[in-house]
Amino acid sequence: ILEAHYTNLKCRCSGVISTVVGLNIIDRIQVTPPGNGCPKTEVVIWTKMKKVICVNPRAKWLQRLLRHVQSKSLSSTPQAPVSKRRAA
């Protein structure tokens, strides 16, 4: 499920984690492209253990995970909803 939202006028991620986050523990993923005062793409993940973390948008594991989630969403109910925030 891809949703369009508006973002705040600044970056939210002051640092990113480098470890892999398994799909089985992910509740939501949010991808925010550059814009509105933040010059970088930000990826925020909410986990089922009630954590919210920023991850490196260029991490290969994340790219694979996003492709997996988006392909699932085309064929069935996604395991982890993806919300894509769009800059104004």
Epitope: I17, V52, I53
Partner: antibody, heavy 122, light 107 residues
């Protein structure tokens, strides 16, 4: 404006059950990412995390007290509750409820109630 | 459980002094550490989050840093309104654990 306020008995006897209520405004526990936690502080001592409850009814407890704690909520009344069974003198403390919101940046316990002093005495 | 060892337990300093207090984590907590300020008779309030980020409305004389498993809160020039207890909290994993607190007094 986010506010929280604790209520409950000021004094109770050993072996009784302590029932605390946190009544809050300015946010809803039906909103994705919202949570309420309970923390206590014996007089002149440090803080101790007790439990958290989240919008989806997920609950987390301090393992050292897990057999005595029950956290719950009433979403429509904007309230969270904590029960501690079989209280004793070491449970004498100021009890706080505090809000957590799973946003980035994540700052757990960003708003606190004023606290309620609870004394366990025979 | 992750243990947070906070030191010193009390600290007395003069106005204008630079002071530092520390918390040591028994396991890796990354940057997931908050410093709370608690003024006498009041509830705690976050002053530093994610180890080094200043919370909203907090004066710039407050700063946070990390060296390995040691996390520090520094006040660059002490003011009278800084007299309070300070608590660190790790939120890397449950159960969340606090340090034992540092009482900051003005000489």
């Amino acid at each position: 404006q986010v506010t929280l306020k604790e209520s409950g008995p000021g004094i109770l006897q050993p072996s009784q059950t302590l029932s605390l209520t946190c009544t809050f405004s300015g946010f809803s526990l039906s909103t994705y990412g919202m949570g309420v936690g309970w923390i206590r502080q014996p007089s002149g001592k440090g803080l101790e995390w007790l439990a958290n409850i989240w919008w989806d009814d997920d609950k987390y407890y301090n393992p050292s007290l897990i057999n005595r704690l029950t956290i719950s909520k009433n979403t429509s009344n904007n309230q969270a509750f904590l029960k501690i069974t079989n209280v004793d003198a070491p449970d004498t403390a100021t009890y706080y409820c505090a809000r957590s919101e799973l946003v980035m940046p994540y700052v757990p316990f960003d708003f606190w109630g004023q606290g309620i002093m609870v004394t366990v005495s025979s | 459980d992750i243990q947070m060892t906070q030191s010193p337990s009390s600290l007395s300093a003069s106005l204008g002094d630079r002071i530092t207090m520390t918390c040591q984590a028994s396991q890796d907590i990354g940057i997931e550490l908050i410093w709370f300020q608690q003024k006498p008779g009041k509830s705690p309030w976050p002053v530093i989050y994610y180890t080094a980020n200043l919370a909203s409305g907090v004066p710039s004389r407050f700063s946070g840093s990390r060296s390995g498993s040691h996390y520090s809160l520094t006040i660059s020039s002490l003011e009278s309104e800084d007299m309070a207890d300070y608590h660190c909290l790790q939120y890397k994993q449950y159960p969340f654990t606090f340090g034992s607190g540092t009482k900051l007094e003005i000489k």
